[in-house]
């Protein structure tokens, strides 16, 4: 631990001013592990006047870093780049001229105190004044900066010409596409200083590239995947005083795939399990030894988890019998397409007959009732009440 | 046996509505998907609209969206198709047809109506 | 949309011949091809779902190969009664789509 400071697992404080520290602490190799520090204090630091970039990136764990009533005059850009866990920051009198936002925008900060600082009246600190002003909170800080005349102003009172906040337009066709297709989106962002603009894509899985001017830009994405469907897509404009962004939200239109089918377990209830991926939702329709199966309650569709295009469900079965074992199958249809997929079950042996057994199907006469196909999620049993093995005969007619 | 029989064809001015029915019997009408085709003099045979067994979805080609309405009435065992805003290239033989594996198959088709849009 | 091509248009053959239908789609529609058989004076009939699966009732000389966009019939042995204006269709996604037709004739 550095002289004039105290370190645990989790802390480092250095508030001793004699000798005091001239540099950021550093932990010794083979001493506490960096990545478990959440909190650094560091108080009358006089000497202690530079945060370079490489400083505090070891403490990824860092959630609390004070450094109060000290010399800090100067933050390095990327000094922070590797600390995504801070949430508080305290740099209450110091010697700060000036601080870029730059400093704190990947972080998702709760506290950013900068009370007691010389700060000099810029563009380059209005960041903090449009921060105040959207937190209005009424513990609000009592900045102020000095201006031209040396004259301490409130920051909550400074006017700069041309520096203001910019605006991000995102011109979106309907951003209702097909799996394969590919779409052009454009955007375009004005504000003074002239902000730059990037595009936000998060964890697109398409592949996509970017045409970007200082106020103008285009994202291409091409050969459309279905898992990009509900994603958001941002357009952000960023200059020294903040940032907007304008956000489309991706929806991709598919075909169905039935990712499972499994034969039957057994819980409170038999379920023949299955999940089926597509969009727009797709209608389902079970077939029971190639005839159309009838839904009542004793034999019904239960979607149980629907994940955005995906949904797991069970067609579930009311105590079945040898009379239900067979061949069953799914189908799954939107306008996009269409997927089929069967599995065998046995659910008992036959009365009198070894379970180990395999007879022949049984040779019943179905009577045709049918059933409504299902759109998931609608588990209405549209049929009279009637016993769950009645089903439709392959052709449709009656005997 | 699985019966479709067309009804309300004829001769309907340009511009004009006509409503066309389909009394279906020999079968569990509820169960099934419905479909209308229709083929024009001396072409081939075009898909027009589909009702899935319960109304859940329904879908339109695109030369007849906005204009053409399908419904069905299950306890009467009758598929509609509202045609509204009629024009000359409407004129076609309509059938319909049942979709007997949930796959857009049509397993049975009726004998057709005449529908004749002309000023 | 899906278009289906459908070859020859005209075919002219004998009762005993075997012949073949080709169906060809703009894009991959799976195995999702139907085959339909029309007859003046009788409601149009399905014969093949789903590329090769033979509709109920339909005798076994009509069979139906293919996956993807290529897709064939073939009538082996024909009878007097095959002869006949003959669609394919593709049943895989909407809006469904019908080949121009093939009329067999008696040669």
């Known amino acids: 631990c550095p002289t004039s400071c105290k370190c645990s697992a989790s802390r480092i404080w250095c508030s001793d001013p004699s000798p005091g520290i001239v540099a950021f602490p550093r932990l010794e190799p083979n001493s506490v592990d960096p990545e478990n520090i959440t909190e650094i204090f560091i108080a009358n630091q006089k000497r202690l006047e530079i945060i370079n970039e490489d400083d505090v990136e070891a403490y990824v764990g860092l959630r609390n870093l004070t450094i109060v009533d000290s010399g800090l005059k100067f933050v390095a850009h990327k000094a922070f780049l590797k600390n995504s866990n801070l949430q508080h920051i305290n740099f209450t009198r110091n010697k700060l001229t000036s601080l870029s936002r730059k400093h704190f925008r990947h972080l998702d900060l709760s506290e950013l105190i900068l009370v007691g600082n010389p700060f000099t009246c810029s563009c380059d600190i209005m960041w903090i004044k449009t921060l105040q002003e959207a937190k209005s909170s009424p513990d609000t800080q009592d900045l102020y900066c000095l201006n031209e005349s040396s004259k301490n102003i409130p920051l909550a009172n400074l006017q700069i010409p041309n520096c203001g906040l910019p605006s991000a337009n995102l011109a979106a066709p309907n951003l209702t596409v097909e799996e394969g297709k590919s779409i052009t989106l454009s955007c375009s962002v004005a504000g003074d200083p002239v902000p730059n603009m990037y595009w936000d894509v998060g964890n697109l899985v398409s592949k996509h590239m970017n045409e970007t001017s200082h106020t103008q830009g285009s994202l291409r994405i091409t050969n459309i995947s279905s898992d990009d469907s509900g994603k958001q897509i941002s357009c952000v404009a960023e200059n020294l005083v903040g940032e907007d962004q304008d956000s489309v939200n991706l929806t991709v239109h598919f075909a169905p795939t039935i990712t499972f089918l499994e034969s039957p377990t057994s819980d409170h209830h038999w379920c023949i399990p299955f999940t089926v991926k597509g969009n727009p939702k797709p209608a389902l329709q079970w077939f029971y030894n190639g005839a159309i199966l009838n839904e009542s309650k004793y034999i019904c569709t239960k979607i149980h988890v629907t994940n955005h295009t995906e949904y797991h469900g069970c067609l579930q079965l009311d105590n079945p019998t040898h009379m239900n074992n067979g061949d069953y199958t799914l189908i799954a249809k939107n306008e996009y397409g269409k997927d089929e997929k069967q599995i065998s079950a046995h659910f008992m042996g036959w009365p009198g007959i070894d379970d180990g057994a395999n007879p022949n199907y049984p040779d019943v006469i179905y009577e045709d009732y049918g059933t409504a196909a299902n759109d998931i999620g609608d588990t209405t049993n549209r049929s009279n009440e009637i016993p769950s093995t009645d089903v439709t005969d392959k052709t449709g007619r009656e005997h | 046996d699985v019966q479709l029989v067309e009804s309300g064809g004829g001769l309907v001015q340009p511009g004009g509505s006509r409503k066309l029915s389909c009394a279906a019997s020999?079968?569990?009408?509820?169960?099934?998907?419905m479909h209308w085709v229709r083929q024009a003099p001396e072409k081939g045979l075009e898909w027009v609209a589909y009702i899935t067994s319960g109304s859940n979805t329904i879908y339109y080609a695109d030369t007849v969206k906005g204009r053409f309405t399908i419904s069905r009435d299950n306890p009467k065992n009758t598929l509609f198709l509202q045609m509204t805003s009629l024009r000359s290239e409407d004129t076609a033989l309509y059938y319909c047809?049942?979709?007997?594996?949930?796959?857009?198959?049509?397993?049975?088709w009726g004998q057709g109506t005449s529908v004749t849009v002309s000023s | 949309d899906v278009q289906i091509t459908q070859s020859p248009s005209y075919l002219a053959a004998s009762p005993g011949e075997t012949i073949t239908i080709n169906c060809r789609a703009s894009?991959?529609?799976?195995?999702?091809l139907a085959w339909y058989q029309e007859k003046p004076g009788k409601t149009n009939k399905l014969l093949i779902y789903s590329g090769s699966t033979l509709q109920s009732g339909i005798p076994s000389r009509f069979s139906g190969s293919g996956s993807g966009t290529d897709f064939t019939l073939t009538i082996s042995s024909l009878e007097p009664e095959d002869f006949a204006m003959y669609y394919c269709?593709?049943?895989?996604?909407?809006?469904?789509?019908f080949g121009a037709g093939t009329k067999l004739e008696l040669k």
């Open positions: 269709q593709q049943h895989n996604e909407f809006p469904l789509t």
């Open positions: 020999g079968f569990t009408f509820s169960s099934f998907g």
């Open positions: 894009k991959s529609i799976s195995k999702y």
């Open positions: 047809a049942r979709d007997g594996y949930f796959l857009d198959a049509l397993d049975y």
